[in-house]
């Protein structure tokens, strides 16, 4: 019903986009399949903090950047906020997404991360800190701050379902995606599944949920057959290149 | 460790406002999106609203939209709930959880309206 | 919204049995969004699994998720005394995220 917002599963073939994409207007209804109803305008979501600008948050940008308002260099309140490029080892931060991959957030400067971000096979018991009571190593603040011990301890990485900070936190096959007001991982696309092409970076912001993207080998394109009156309504769908 | 530590109930006239507020310690707050969710006495647990790590997106139960206002304060590590127009209804401990699926809880906060 | 429908609603059995509580959804949930909670009187809930079969940290492994589509199980293989409680589903696939009504887990 329309009381109900439904995600779309990347295990659900062929389904318009329900926001942000091809998939009808905010506002909208889009009927999907039989007894599923994509709301396009989210009835539960509230935009009273958000600017439409080009991003909200760090996760609308590309892997090698970070939201923020460009006049302070980190995220704050009010004031137009944009994808910034990400900080190599040795610039100031303020948190981990400031930094480039590979690199973390060490007492404000970007520093390199020894264990390649999330380690998730074998690392020291002391690096994980808040970790250890985190029921997913992706979720928590895991990053080296002492190196005293050297017990060993395992994470594996996240599952579909789990929370996450970045993709590289999610097993294979899953990215680490938007859904509502968390993060978690979600299934990479396969070939026809619905996707989401944005005509720029940050464009995304309204969404209330993101996809994956298409996994190897495929591109986000318009699908050949689907005619629609209106070129920025068109269904997107994985295709191979 | 990861501590979520909720204040701010107490008895309130119907009509009247409250401020909720969680303190949050032991994991980075800005990295988490942040739920309330409500459990009348006797009864299960109701969802009440969640805003996103940079508090860029708030989302509410249809129950207290338009009368509850989620927001959060990074540089505190504080999470807050406004509740203006309250009733009787919303009497509640009123628990403040992290993520999505609450991986965290406070030990929550009783919300009582009542004449 | 999505409904869950949780049962039985209240399980009698003896330390050592097995326990198998039901959540089942009114739509199908097409990915496994769906957690299970142990609650205790007097206390906050506790996660025990998430992503449909994932256990939280410092639950033991007695405690196991299974299912997708509409049925979700969580099972306790061998019942301690301190499980005895009422456990709640929650599905975070839409908005709005909804709980099960719970099911109590009582000594016999």
């Known amino acids: 019903t329309l009381n109900s917002v439904l995600i779309n599963s990347n295990a659900i073939k062929n389904l318009p986009p329900p926001l942000g994409g091809a998939g009808g207007q905010p506002g909208s209804a889009v009927s999907v399949a039989p007894g599923v109803l994509y709301e396009g305008g989210n009835k539960y979501q509230t935009l009273d903090n958000y600017q439409p600008y080009p991003c909200a948050e760090d996760e609308e940008c590309g892997s090698d950047e970070y939201c923020s308002s460009p006049s302070r260099g980190a995220a704050g309140v009010g004031g137009v906020q944009i994808c910034l490029a990400c900080r190599k080892r040795r610039k100031r931060c303020m948190r981990h997404a400031m930094c480039c991959p590979g690199n973390y957030c060490k007492n404000g400067i970007c520093m390199p991360s020894d264990h390649s971000h999330f380690p998730r096979g074998e690392i020291e018991e002391s690096i994980i800190e808040n970790l250890g009571n985190d029921h997913n190593a992706a979720a928590g603040d895991g990053y080296p701050r002492r190196t005293t011990l050297t017990s060993k301890i395992y994470h594996t990485k996240g599952q579909e379902g789990s929370v996450c900070l970045r993709s590289s936190d999610c097993a294979a096959g899953l990215c680490c995606a938007r859904h509502f007001w968390s993060k978690i991982c979600k299934p990479v696309l396969k070939e026809g599944q619905v996707c989401t092409k944005h005509k720029r970076k940050g464009s995304h912001g309204l969404e209330i949920f993101q996809r994956c993207y298409c996994g190897e080998g495929l591109a986000c394109r318009i699908q050949k057959d689907h005619h629609q009156a209106s070129n920025s309504s068109r269904l997107h769908t994985c295709q191979r290149h | 460790q990861v501590q979520l530590v909720e204040s701010g109930g107490g008895l309130v006239q119907p009509g009247g406002s409250l401020r909720l507020s969680c303190a949050a310690s032991?994991?980075?707050?800005?990295?988490?999106?942040m739920t309330w969710v409500r459990q009348a006495p006797g009864k299960g647990l109701e969802w009440v609203s969640g805003?996103?790590?940079?508090?860029?997106?708030?989302y509410y139960a249809d129950s207290v939209k338009g009368r509850f206002t989620i927001s959060r304060d990074n540089s505190k590590n504080t999470l807050y709930l406004q509740m203006n127009s309250l009733r009787a209804e919303d009497t509640a401990v009123y628990y403040c959880?992290?993520?999505?699926?609450?991986?965290?809880w406070g030990q929550g906060t009783l919300v009582t309206v009542s004449s | 919204d999505i409904v869950l429908t949780q049962s039985p609603a209240t399980l009698s059995l003896s330390p050592g049995e097995r326990a198998t509580l039901s959540c089942r959804a009114s739509?199908?949930?097409?990915?496994?969004?769906l957690a299970w909670y142990q609650q205790k009187p007097g206390q906050a809930p506790r996660l025990l699994i998430y992503?449909?079969?994932n256990r939280a940290t410092g639950v033991p492994a007695r405690f196991s998720g299974s299912g997708s589509g509409t049925d979700f199980t969580l099972t306790i293989s061998s019942l301690e005394p301190e499980d005895f409680a009422v456990y709640y589903c929650?599905?975070?696939?839409?908005?709005?995220?909804?709980f099960g009504q719970g099911t109590k887990v009582e000594i016999k």
């Open positions: 929650q599905q975070y696939l839409s908005l709005p995220t909804t």
């Open positions: 992503g449909a079969s």
């Open positions: 032991g994991f980075t707050f800005n990295n988490y999106g």
């Open positions: 959880a992290r993520t999505i699926y609450m991986d965290y």
């Open positions: 805003i996103s790590g940079s508090g860029s997106y708030t």
């Open positions: 739509q199908n949930l097409f990915s496994p969004y």
